[in-house]
């Protein structure tokens, strides 16, 4: 376990070999979750890229947060995708939080502390627990089959995950840098493995 506070993983160039694998202590399927993170890239007007890829043996796009060029954020649960359109692209560090719950299928997507309109996805589904969680690449199969054209070039950090839906107040607290206790992925006690050319550097966001 490593305390990654105020640090970020840096992916300096496009590749299909550089990634970070995160280890999560999941023992049972997820009926809800929240993922929050920071990232910083210049790619958004150039091509799509993977932000957070959670694959199971049954479904490579079990949870996927992806930037789709010309559209905006793509959010996938169990292979089913919805989009959160972004009309104007700016180059700046971005904080995102996204949550999903099985009971209602409701998805929340927050960008820099501001909520997008809620949408619905995969009501009644459960997310598999035996997962390969990858930063820097999009998994087209469990733990692999990467495409360089989907890789992240830039920084990612403060990756935290919960097995429940955070309240709006909690998400606001996280965005503002307040205290929180993630129970699936914890950036302050992170188990991870680096493959390829990935560097750990001080974070560039406040």
């Amino acid at each position: 376990q490593t305390d990654m506070s105020r640090k970020a993983f840096v992916f300096p160039k496009e590749s299909d070999t550089s990634y970070v694998s995160l280890k999560a202590p999941l023992t049972k399927p997820l009926k809800a979750f929240t993922v929050c993170l920071h990232f910083y890239t210049e790619l958004s007007s150039t091509r799509g890229y993977s932000i957070f890829s959670y694959a199971t043996k049954r479904q490579d796009n079990e949870i996927l947060i992806f930037w789709s060029k010309d559209i905006g954020y793509s959010f996938t649960v169990g292979g089913s995708e919805i989009l959160f359109e972004v009309p104007e692209v700016t180059v700046a560090p971005v904080h995102i939080c996204t949550s999903w719950e099985s009971a209602s299928g409701i998805v929340e997507f927050w960008v820099d502390g501001k909520p997008r309109v809620r949408k619905s996805l995969k009501k009644g589904y459960t997310v598999g627990a035996e997962a390969s969680i990858i930063l820097g690449q999009e998994q087209d199969s469990f733990g692999g089959n990467f495409e360089g054209s989907q890789s992240l070039v830039g920084d990612i950090g403060n990756v935290n995950m919960w097995d429940f839906v955070l309240s709006p107040d909690e998400i606001n607290t996280i965005y503002l840098g307040g205290p929180f206790s993630p129970n699936v992925l914890n950036w302050r006690a992170l188990k991870y493995e680096v493959q390829g050319e990935v560097f750990t550097k001080p974070q560039l966001w406040p």
Epitope: S68, I71, S74, T76, S80, E81
Partner: nanobody, 116 residues
């Protein structure tokens, strides 16, 4: 094995209409959002439109919004793209895709040529 087979392309005059179809097999079609992308004569890939798995949400690129309509029939495992008020710049090979992250041709595509 995932298979996507597009059809319905052809030669059409500016201002005309066409309806493209994409027959899907090898996966549970109703579980997936589906997209149309196109490859222009200069080989650029452009996203055109996306429809969510349950027909709940549709999304369009600025260049086709108001002229194209994406739809699907989950019972027939088929995706559609109704194209109207076609312009010469709509000339392209049109591909259907299972996910917007699959931003590269996965199938044969169908050629649409808009010319007087």
């Amino acid at each position: 094995e995932v298979k996507l087979l597009e059809s319905g392309g052809g030669l059409v005059k500016p201002g005309g209409s066409l309806k493209l179809s994409c027959a899907a097999s090898g996966f549970t079609f109703s579980d997936y959002g589906m997209s149309w992308i196109r490859q222009t004569p200069d080989k650029r890939l452009e996203w055109v439109a996306t429809i969510s798995s349950g027909n709940t949400y549709t999304y369009y690129s600025k260049s086709v919004k108001g002229r194209f309509t994406i739809s699907r029939d989950n019972a027939k495992n088929t995706l559609y793209l109704q194209m109207s008020s076609l312009k010469s710049e709509d000339t392209a090979i049109y591909y259907c895709s299972r996910h917007t992250s699959d931003y590269y041709p996965l199938s044969q595509g169908t050629l649409v040529t808009v010319s007087a």
